[in-house]
């Protein structure tokens, strides 16, 4: 049967600062999460079957005047969907996606959600990683920030 | 054959008002719009088939300034994506986007687009609709504002 | 076998100014790029195989201020996907986004992303074209600038 | 290496004004947030107010909202504290912070804080 994976956010282990960092907690098995001829494992989607897969992330950054003081209204808020290949060990960028903000103190609450997706050759053992910027600003919704993968095809 | 439908906005009939509304007026069979083997009815995309669904929306907003003058220059520009189960009456969101927005005076003419996507267990009977806030600011074009799925694979 | 497309941009070629022009240049057979039962000619995406296909774009803009003086900080940065009818000579734009942004002379460096993605019937022929406003500004990289397709399913 | 040196403190009567001023040195001023404290006899350093590189945000302690103003002159590479409606319990030594950690969010922890000034003595007669 073709491979799938949803996985959504496990808020309970997101990192602080605002250097981008690979974000290795995430729901398979709850929720809108999911996973069927895939393996998720230390924080990666690992492909187990060759294919032509579509990937997607949809990454949601927030902040409220309640959660504390942001160190800086300039903030660059990122998402990189890479893929790692353990036989050749080296990690690339697929995809990327966001945006400079500016979230002054005039506006007590600030939103903003990042979509990449594409279509991308995977082979067995190579695995998918999501890395984004201020980790602490995102949404911990799982409907919010989610990333996933389905195959469509096989290689010729 | 695999069912799908791509909606896209019937203009003639947004809501006014900046708070959440559900869009119910889509186009199903012009322009760009289609739909096979799903059902579109009371603004709702009724899944008459088991299945992995890809679900996805993009969303414009648009405002100028001879449309007359924004309430507020601080928007919530949102897309809330939800699915509704009648056997039990629920209703979840599947995928939330967008962004919070300074449309200030300086400028004659704002933009912003969302787009949401992600794959989803939908079961025959459950009903896919689409939530904005701020829906007098929607952009009417069919190529803008839309919605839509396809069938990926079966529920094993 | 199922025909797809993944067209990374081709930055050697990129034209100037601030007006919406068609992206021209794009790999089709390095790096992430690659086609199959799909043609890249003259700078469109020519479809081989009737079809409903998924089509994507993903679109980044970025500048730093080492790059030089914006012309102006209101920008309004935008993405087309168009079909052109070869048999009734027609262009049509499927999808669009974009945001416009106040890129000020405060932050070193600002950046933006785009993404658009939607269900469309193709026939042979026809022809995928992307356009973009402020192509000057676009991200060079392959993770970053992209469009593709792939066919789910035939017309019935 | 950063090097703060504040000026401005004194003795002021109750319901009166002081400006405490922050001179910094060193890398990029603009870059980095700035924060002041206070820390009374034989209590502990306490959290007053802090401001972002830009100057574009500004956070208070509850106990000073609405009467104190912490701004920032990024050309002159200095950082204010406008202290009005002073009350005896303000008496403290007042000391300004360099925030140079790369956190999203600034904390009002003053062991987060990575640069500090000698403090300047503030007195608030009754």
């Known amino acids: 049967a073709q491979p799938f994976a949803h996985l959504t956010i496990n808020a309970t282990n997101i990192p602080t600062g605002s250097h981008k960092v690979s974000l290795s907690s995430w729901y398979h098995d709850r929720g809108w999460a999911k996973i069927s001829n895939m393996t998720f494992s230390n924080g990666k989607l690992i492909v187990n079957q060759d294919g032509f897969y579509y990937l997607y992330a949809n990454i949601c950054f927030r902040h409220h005047e309640t959660s504390g003081d942001l160190a800086t209204e300039y903030l660059q808020l990122m998402v990189y969907v890479t893929k790692t290949s353990i036989k050749i060990p080296s990690s690339h960028t697929l995809m990327k996606g966001g945006s400079t903000k500016y979230w002054s103190g005039n506006s007590e609450f600030h939103f903003y959600s990042i979509n990449v997706g594409g279509f991308f050759k995977l082979r067995s053992g190579e695995e998918i990683s999501v890395e984004v910027s201020n980790p602490s600003l995102l949404d911990p919704d799982q409907d919010a920030t989610y990333f996933g993968a389905f195959k469509v095809r096989d290689i010729d | 054959a695999q069912p799908f439908a791509h909606l896209t906005i019937n203009a003639t009939n947004i809501p006014t008002g900046s708070h959440k509304v559900s869009l119910s007026s889509w186009y199903h069979d012009r322009g760009w719009a289609k739909i096979s083997n799903m059902t579109f009815s009371n603004g709702k995309l009724i899944v008459n088939q088991d299945g992995f669904y890809y679900l996805y929306a993009n969303i414009c907003f648009r405002h100028h300034e001879t449309s007359g003058d924004l309430a507020t220059e601080y928007l919530q520009l949102m897309v809330y994506v939800t699915k509704t189960s009648i056997k039990i009456p629920s209703s979840h969101t599947l995928m939330k986007g967008g962004s919070t927005k300074y449309w200030s005076g300086n400028s004659e003419f704002h933009f912003y687009s969302i787009n949401v996507g992600g794959f989803f267990k939908l079961r025959s009977g459950e009903e896919i609709s689409v939530e904005v806030s701020n829906p007098s600011l929607l952009d009417p074009d069919q190529d803008a504002t839309y919605f839509g799925a396809f069938k990926v694979r079966d529920i094993d | 076998a199922q025909p797809f497309a993944h067209l990374t941009i081709n930055a050697t070629n990129i034209p100037t100014g601030s007006h919406k022009v068609s992206l021209s240049s794009w790999y089709h057979d390095r790096g992430w790029a690659k086609i199959s039962n799909m043609t890249f000619s003259n700078g469109k995406l020519i479809v081989n195989q009737d079809g409903f296909y998924y089509l994507y774009a993903n679109i980044c803009f970025r500048h730093h201020e080492t790059s030089g003086d914006l012309a102006t900080e209101y920008l309004q940065l935008m993405v087309y996907v168009t079909k052109t009818s070869i048999k009734i000579p027609s262009s049509h734009t499927l999808m669009k986004g974009g945001s416009t942004k106040y890129w000020s002379g405060n932050s070193e460096f600002h950046f933006y992303s785009i993404n658009v993605g939607g269900f469309f019937k193709l026939r042979s022929g026809e022809e995928i074209s992307v356009e973009v406003s402020n192509p000057s500004l676009l991200d060079p990289d392959q993770d970053a600038t992209y469009f593709g397709a792939f066919k789910v399913r035939d017309i019935d | 290496e950063v090097q703060l040196v504040e000026s401005g403190g004194g003795l002021v009567q109750a319901g009166g004004s002081l400006r405490l001023s922050c001179a910094a040195s060193g890398r990029t001023f603009r870059s980095y947030p700035m924060g002041w404290f206070r820390q009374a006899p034989g209590k502990e350093r306490e959290f007053v107010a802090s401001i972002t590189g830009s100057g574009g945000s500004t956070y208070y302690a509850d106990s000073v909202k609405g009467r104190f103003t912490i701004s920032r002159d990024n050309a002159k590479n200095t950082v204010y504290l406008q202290m009005n409606s002073l009350r005896p319990e303000d008496t403290a030594v007042y000391s300004c912070?360099?925030?140079?950690?790369?956190?999203?969010?600034?904390?009002?922890?003053?062991?987060?804080?990575?640069?500090w000034g000698q403090g300047t003595q503030v007195t608030v007669s009754s």
């Open positions: 912070a360099a925030y140079i950690r790369p956190d999203t969010y600034l904390s009002r922890d003053y062991r987060k804080y990575d640069y």
